[in-house]
């Protein structure tokens, strides 16, 4: 004969568990019905009734099988540093991300409670660790013979170009200025001259070498002076 | 459902310590409170201590307050049992069962239980 099929509340065999979507109601001392996500228990088991479930009011959520007497409050709305990653319904909390260019300072249960900006390396400083989801943008001092002249939270430090004759070498913040040494052209008086760098760049991934090219016919000398070498900025 | 897995349990001094660990999977473990049971062979199964849904507030059974210590690691989805000075009479095996939202320890029913760990306090 086939095993009886027992229904909810019924009392479990002594050692044994209930069974999936049932729990063990420790009043009653039977297995109980929980109620399925986007509900609640309006009624808790006894042992000759089973639990009875009613809908989460808006606002409120149950993601679980369950049988909380209330449904839980749906988290505040996102604040104007976040994005709504997932709405409030019935089943789900809302869950509030950090907008780009801001990471999660305080994490909570899903989602971020406090978002902060990526911090931004000055000019003589890159970034040594890109900024995550949950971390800090690293700045870190240019080493000699590299620089960086933004103020950002993804440039690193770039090499200085490679001159055959250097015009105004370069510094931290700066990148080095050449000038050239064959006469291909006549020019007007006091032009500098900026060949093309051995190396090309990238704003954000370490640069690969290219052969020397053709010197250029002009360029131009950065404006003013160069900034203080300060690590970030909260700007 | 979240699935349970218990481990950490031997054979022990008395005097010693223990500590157990309560893995969950299927999933997060935050959402829940969680208990640990022991049961010692030929008795009912008792609830040693809790540890509530937001981690706010913990429970232990007279016979262990003092010398055991609840505690959850909720990135690495785990529940742990630290025991001191342990005595014969903690001889059982210790069980980890859950409650979703579970707001007040004890717990108010019981939802998955792992296959326990036995624990063995003997000279």
């Known amino acids: 004969l086939p095993a009886q099929v027992a229904f909810t509340p019924y009392a479990p065999e002594p050692g044994s568990t209930c069974r999936l979507r049932e729990y063990y109601d420790q009043t009653a001392q039977m297995c109980c019905s929980k109620c399925s996500p986007g509900q609640h228990a309006k009624v808790f088991c006894t042992k000759t009734s089973d639990t009875v479930c009613d809908s989460c009011e808006d606002s409120t959520y149950t993601q679980l099988w369950n049988w909380v007497p209330e449904c839980l409050s749906c988290g505040s709305r996102c604040s104007s540093d976040q994005v709504e990653t997932q709405a409030c319904t019935r089943e789900q909390n809302r869950i509030c991300t950090c907008r780009p260019g801001w990471y999660c300072a305080l994490s909570k249960q899903e989602g971020c409670r406090l978002c902060a900006p990526l911090r931004k390396c000055r000019p003589g400083f890159g970034v040594a660790r890109p900024g995550t989801e949950t971390s800090d943008v690293v700045c870190k001092p240019c080493a000699p013979g590299t620089f960086s002249n933004t103020t950002s939270s993804t440039d690193i430090c770039r090499p200085h170009q490679i001159c055959n004759v250097v015009a105004i070498p370069g510094n931290a913040s700066m990148d080095a200025v050449c000038t050239s040494t064959s006469p291909t052209r006549s020019m007007a008086p006091g032009a500098v001259h900026l060949p093309q760098p051995v190396s090309t760049r990238s704003q954000h991934t370490q640069p690969t070498p290219e052969p020397s090219t053709a010197p250029s016919t002009s360029f131009l000398l950065p404006m003013g002076p160069s900034p203080p070498a300060e690590g970030s900025t909260g700007d | 459902e979240v699935q349970l897995v218990e481990s950490g349990g031997g054979l022990v001094q008395p005097g010693g310590s223990l500590r157990l660990s309560c893995a969950a999977s299927?999933?997060?473990?935050?959402?829940?409170?969680v208990a640990w049971f022991r049961q010692a062979p030929g008795k009912e199964r008792e609830e040693v201590s809790c540890?509530?849904?937001?981690?706010?507030?913990?429970n232990y059974a007279e016979s262990v307050k003092g010398r055991f210590t609840i505690s959850r690691d909720n990135s690495k989805n785990t529940l742990y049992l630290q025991m001191n000075s342990l005595r014969a009479e903690d001889t059982a095996v210790y069980y980890c069962t859950t409650e979703p939202y579970g707001s007040s320890c004890p717990l108010s029913g019981y939802d998955t239980w792992g296959q326990g760990t036995l624990v063995t306090v003997s000279s």
């Open positions: 540890i509530t849904y937001s981690g706010g507030s913990t």
């Open positions: 299927g999933s997060r473990l935050d959402y829940y409170a």
